[in-house]
């Protein structure tokens, strides 16, 4: 009996692999170990087939490799003898999306595995609060995202649709701004951006607190709590306190959870260490002056959430100061 005459046919397997733009990925392929191993990874589009990586006669063969894959692919050469034909793919680009076939031939069989590669990107979005003249706006912004995300807004937990969307990047990655006019409103707002491919969701929440009326020389406590519903215990986050003045934001304090470092840019600003340990980032501003009147913004941000809390502080002259005038 000539064993070489008996060849096993294995139907084409298909796997979907999801990678991130700029990162590395492994396209998996395995086979029943055997001698005389030949591996051909190819990329298939509607019209052509492109050589991605080949291996035969005991070494990688890149003479006919398509230039777009140069220095970006390799096999696990030490693992081939164990049946591993997986491709290590470096620095993914959106153009790498598509169908890859891995042909593996040995002395006794040939198989073809199909891998569908999808590439996504989701740079952490931001929620910004802006004042333009007498108008107030909330902007949800994602600098780089692919594929197009689903963006939803809620006002007091009720979905709303009236927002202004701007998009750049015709083929992707996209840069998207979604703007909501919230002039005169003291409702809470929530913006959610979802990348369905990467199964990643980011939520920005904006809350306007009741206005605080204080007298000159007094101190004020501005509340800002990290809500456990939003943040998991081991998640890194940052807290920024800033002041909005004539549409310009100036930072007052900054805290980084990963290093537990706090930086103050205003000497009259402080927070209670005890409260901070309980994820309460409420601030004290002492020795108030008339010029301290305005909007104070607390921003707690992680990869998945941004919580914006706005306080409006009105500082009024004390009686002594009033009678001096």
């Amino acid at each position: 009996i000539f064993l070489s005459a008996f060849f096993t046919y294995v139907p084409m397997n298909e796997q979907i692999i999801i990678g991130r733009l700029g990162e590395d990925i492994i396209l998996p392929s395995s086979f029943e170990r055997g001698s005389e191993v030949v591996i051909h990874w190819k990329y298939q589009d509607s019209y052509n087939s492109y050589n991605v990586h080949s291996y035969y006669k005991g070494s990688g063969r890149l003479e006919s490799q398509d230039t777009r894959y140069a220095n970006r692919t390799s096999l696990f050469y030490n693992e081939i003898q164990n049946g591993n034909a997986s491709l290590f793919f470096r620095r993914l680009s959106l153009l790498d999306e598509g169908i890859y076939t891995c042909y593996v031939g040995t002395a006794i069989q040939a198989i073809t595995n199909k891998v569908v590669l999808k590439v996504g990107v989701f740079l952490t979005p931001m929620m910004k609060y802006e004042k333009r003249n007498t108008n107030s706006f909330l902007i949800c912004n994602v600098l780089s995202v692919y594929p197009r995300p689903i963006i939803t807004w809620k006002m007091d937990n009720t979905p709303i649709s009236e927002n202004n969307m701007q998009e750049t990047g015709s083929l992707g990655p996209f840069s998207i701004n979604s703007t909501l006019n919230i002039t005169g409103s003291n409702s809470s707002y929530e913006c959610t951006i979802e990348n369905s491919l990467l199964k990643q969701t980011w939520t920005g929440r904006w809350t306007m607190k009741d206005g605080l009326h204080k007298m000159q020389s007094e101190h004020v406590s501005l509340s800002c709590e990290l809500v456990n519903d939003y943040f998991s215990p081991n998640q890194d986050f940052k807290v920024t306190w800033s002041r909005m003045e004539s549409g310009i934001s100036s930072i007052l304090a900054y805290y980084l959870s990963s290093s537990q470092n706090t930086t103050f840019y205003e000497s009259r600003f402080s927070w209670n260490k005890e409260l901070k340990n309980q994820s309460d980032f409420s601030m004290n501003l002492t020795d108030l002056s008339l010029s301290d009147s305005g909007e104070y913004l607390c921003n707690i941000s992680s990869d998945e959430y941004t919580l914006l809390t706005i306080h409006t502080v009105h500082v009024e002259p004390s009686q002594e100061t009033a009678s001096d005038n």
């Epitope: 005389e36 030949v38 051909h40 087939s49 006669k57 042909y103 002395a107 040939a110």
Partner: antibody
Framework: QVQLVESGGGVVQPGRSLRLSCAAS????????LHWVRQAPGRGLEWVAV????????YYADSVKGRFTISRDNSKKSLYLQMNSLRAEDTAVYFC??????????????WGQGTLVTVSS | DIQMTQSPSTLSASVGDRVTITCRAS??????LAWYQQKPGKAPKLLIY???SLESGVPSRFSGSGSGTEFTLTISSLQPDDFATYYC????????FGQGTKLEIK
């Protein structure tokens, strides 16, 4: 079992063309590279051309480059050799041979019985 | 192009003899060498690949050795069925055959 059957040979005048075919059975045709090898009467073997499993690559011996074209139709499980500008020195038995796998290895566990091409005026 | 030179061109031997055929490459071909047996009017038959690997179904009296540029095919004990022409083939770079060695009965 693997079977390769060549056809299309015959007598042809110098400068004319001929097309050889090789019908395959007994294996998954689209998984294997295929070669043409020839043997002039009373002489040794000469490799002519190879085409890879998916038709993506083809290579030729210098003696036939630019005159012969190897092709395949995976749906018909057939291999072809289009021979143009034939010369007397192309007279030979033409064998269809299957590569060990994709075509990249270049040796032949399976052969057809051959078809004779005679180039003569 | 890589040239393959076989020696001898003709070899006379008797049943039971141990015979050796040599094949020399014009440049190193690592171990990418195959040996074939061909009988008159028939297609060649693969005996050895990768210089020393025995193709399945081929009797163990056939063996191959060598690497680089020098290779040998050995038949340890000639059988009546072994009288034929033997070809070496390099497949390091495309493919080239040796001119053949005719093994005939003494």
């Amino acid at each position: 079992q693997v079977q390769l059957v060549e056809s299309g040979g015959g007598v042809v005048q110098p400068g004319r063309s001929l097309r050889l075919s090789c019908a395959a059975s007994g294996f998954t045709f689209s998984d294997y590279g295929l070669h043409w090898v020839r043997q002039a009467p009373g002489r040794g073997l000469e490799w002519v051309a190879v085409i890879w499993y998916d038709g993506s690559e083809e290579y030729y011996a210098d003696s036939v480059k630019g005159r012969f074209t190897i092709s395949r139709d995976n749906s018909k499980k057939s291999l072809y050799l289009q021979m143009n500008s034939l010369r007397a020195e192309d007279t030979a038995v033409y064998f269809c041979a299957r590569d060990r796998n994709s075509g990249a290895l270049g040796y032949f566990p399976h052969w057809g019985q051959g078809t004779l091409v005679t180039v003569s005026s | 192009d890589i040239q393959m030179t076989q020696s001898p061109s003709t070899l006379s031997a008797s049943v039971g003899d141990r015979v050796t055929i040599t094949c020399r490459a014009s440049q190193s071909i690592n171990n990418w060498l195959a040996w074939y047996q061909q009988k008159p009017g028939k297609a060649p038959k693969l005996l050895i690949y990768k210089a020393s690997s025995l193709e399945s179904g081929v009797p163990s009296r056939f063996s191959g050795s060598g690497s680089g540029t020098e290779f040998t095919l050995t038949i340890s004990s000639l059988q009546p069925d072994d009288f034929a022409t033997y070809y070496c083939q390099q497949y390091n770079s495309y493919s080239t055959f040796g001119q053949g060695t005719k093994l005939e009965i003494k």
